[in-house]
């Protein structure tokens, strides 16, 4: 006689919401074997018993977690096989904060995995990556675990958050870090990853009167996704003494995008220029506060933007759009940046 369980593992991980069948069968030389599942919770799956076999159907609910035992007997001989069933939830729902990292600032980055089960620090681990390696020098703060607010009762899913204090990101700063969350289950390792773009600062010297960091530029072909998706990051080359600075994209491919220049000597006037062939127009589409309160001059492939009355540029995101195509370039200007006083 032979006693078989399929799948044969003694531990089985089942994704929440998915079903699994465990078939236990036994052949018997002296007639029909008796096969049944025991140690079942009333809620643990459903059992279909046939001559010489028994099928346990697990529905992928958290209540299905348990250790049923299949018992098979043939005459005076009996066999048994236990299966530890672990139902897990690990959707690709990572949220990182902040949305962008600013080099040169002592900052905390957090990564939250939502709707997790089991909420066990031994099975869930977080890592902050630079490329494929753990970021050296990051300091892990205490992890947090909170129960998610659920619409349905009896589904205690959790969100787990890990925070890190970042080391200096170096010069030049890397284009991005990644939060990686790994769930380690019996014979199963699952990983999700979320990018945290690093804003690249201009590399020219600071003007004498700046009291905070320089502006940062990033480009994206989609306005709506600029905050949540991977971005082509641009940097500003150095060319003292503070002339108009033109962004240069780090990626060699992709659509042709507008360029934003800053004229530090003209009271922080911004110029957006189309960088492609003829027939392209540009316009300012976003500025902190109300765009209507700014002074705008638009002339085909060039568009100027300045503050009224003349003064320091307001803190926040500025965006210029190029048509046709809809490509945009975003510029972030930190607060308290004062124009260069030319001597």
């Amino acid at each position: 006689q032979s006693f078989q369980v399929n799948p044969p593992e003694s531990e089985v991980a089942v994704a929440m919401g998915t079903s699994l069948q465990i078939t236990c069968s036994m052949s018997c030389d002296e007639g029909v074997a008796r096969v049944h599942w025991r140690g079942l919770d009333t809620s643990l799956g459903s059992v279909q018993t046939l001559p010489g076999s028994s099928i346990l159907s697990v529905r992928g609910m958290l209540s299905d977690t348990g250790t049923p035992v299949c018992v098979g007997s043939c005459g005076s001989r009996s066999f048994q096989h236990s299966v530890k069933i672990l139902v897990y939830a690990f959707p690709d729902q990572l949220v990182v904060s902040p949305e962008f990292l600013v080099p040169g600032q002592d900052q905390v980055v957090s990564c939250t995995a939502h709707n997790i089960w089991p909420a066990d620090p031994n099975s869930l681990s977080f890592a902050l990556l630079l490329g494929e390696q753990r970021l050296e020098g990051a300091q892990a703060l205490e992890p947090e675990q909170e129960e998610e607010i659920q619409e349905a009762e009896g589904t205690p899913l959790f969100r787990m958050t890990q925070r890190w204090r970042l080391p200096s990101l170096g010069t030049p700063a890397p284009p991005a870090l990644h939060c990686q969350v790994t769930m380690q289950l019996p014979k199963l390792v699952l990983t999700h990853r979320k990018e945290i773009p690093v804003l690249q600062s201009q590399t020219s010297p600071k003007p004498p009167n700046t009291t905070s960091a320089e502006p940062y530029i990033l480009t994206s072909s989609s306005t709506a996704e600029a905050v949540s998706t991977g971005l082509n990051i641009t940097t500003l080359p150095s060319a003292p003494p503070y002339p108009k600075l033109s962004p240069r994209t780090l990626s060699s491919e992709g659509p042709c995008r507008p360029k934003i220049h800053q004229d530090l000597e003209a009271g922080w006037e911004l110029l957006c220029e189309a960088s492609c062939g003829p027939g392209v127009t540009v316009r300012w589409t976003l500025a902190p506060g109300d765009l209507a309160t700014y002074h705008k001059r638009e002339a085909g492939a060039q568009a100027w933007l300045s503050v009224l009355p003349p003064g320091p540029m307001v803190e926040g995101w500025f965006q210029c759009r190029q048509d046709p195509g809809g490509e945009v370039t975003n510029l972030y200007v930190p607060g308290q940046v004062t124009p260069n006083s030319s001597s």
Epitope: D106, V108, R134, E136, G137, Q139, A140, L141, E142, R163, R165, L166, P167, S168
Partner: antibody, heavy 119, light 107 residues
Framework: EVQLLESGGGLVQPGGSLRLSCAAS????????MHWVRQAPGKGLEWVSY????????NYADSVKGRFTISRDNSKNTLYLQMNSLRAEDTAVYYC????????????WGKGTTVTVSS | DIQMTQSPSSLSASVGDRVTITCRAS??????LAWYQQKPGKAPKLLIY???SLQSGVPSRFSGSGSGTDFTLTISSLQPEDFATYYC?????????FGQGTKVEIK
């Protein structure tokens, strides 16, 4: 010169409260995460609590969670530790300390203030 | 929590001796380790940070090495003012933890 000067220690009965202060000078206080570290008589160093530069992040050792509260007043360059429900095992020298951005080692320590919990 | 184990807990040495103190972490802490010196009645003083970097103003006879879980503090030639208690500390993750200390006494 960078300096940290603790005050507020003393003798208190079990169950009592005490508030420690730490006056900082010689550096931009609001840019630094600050810590309290304690040392029981004849024992080693034990980290107690931290607070971030803006005060937005705090954390505590399990042994003091729910009883101690760390806070700071950046306008006064002062760090505080409010200690409630004190126990005999809280008896120690309490040091105020600063850690360095990007490195996170504790590079500056105060001279310490002694807290004695006894009836 | 990450446990830090120092050895020896105490040692006797003479002026001019080479002294080595070891510190072991219960899990990898990369290079997030500092060494402190403390004299009786005084606050600790930072000697080494990032496992092997000498803090400004600290004599070059002090050196640190190691990465991952095993670390060493070496005093190349012990001076009279070096008799003190030395602590290692990991700051890779919270709660930050200290070794139990190594007391260096005069032989």
């Amino acid at each position: 010169e960078v300096q940290l000067l603790e005050s507020g220690g003393g003798l208190v009965q079990p169950g009592g409260s005490l508030r420690l202060s730490c006056a900082a000078s010689g550096f931009t206080f609001s840019s630094y995460w600050m810590h309290w570290v304690r040392q029981a008589p004849g024992k080693g160093l034990e980290w107690v609590s931290y607070i971030s530069g803006s005060g937005g992040y705090t954390n505590y050792a399990d042994s003091v969670k729910g009883r101690f509260t760390i806070s700071r007043d950046n306008s006064k360059n002062t760090l505080y530790l409010q200690m409630n429900s004190l126990r005999a095992e809280d008896t120690a020298v309490y040091y105020c300390a600063r850690d360095r951005p990007y490195y996170y080692d504790i590079d500056v320590w105060g001279k310490g203030t002694t807290v004695t919990v006894s009836s | 929590d990450i446990q830090m184990t120092q050895s020896p807990s105490s040692l006797s040495a003479s002026v001019g001796d080479r002294v080595t103190i070891t510190c072991r972490a219960s899990q990898s802490i990369s290079s997030s380790l500092a060494w402190y010196q403390q004299k009786p009645g005084k606050a600790p003083k930072l000697l080494i940070y990032a496992a092997s970097s000498l803090q400004s103003g600290v004599p070059s006879r002090f050196s640190g090495s190691g990465s991952g879980t095993d670390f060493t503090l070496t005093i190349s030639s012990l001076q009279p003012e070096d008799f003190a208690t030395y602590y290692c500390q990991q700051y890779k993750s919270y709660p930050v933890t200290f070794g139990q200390g190594t007391k260096v006494e005069i032989k």
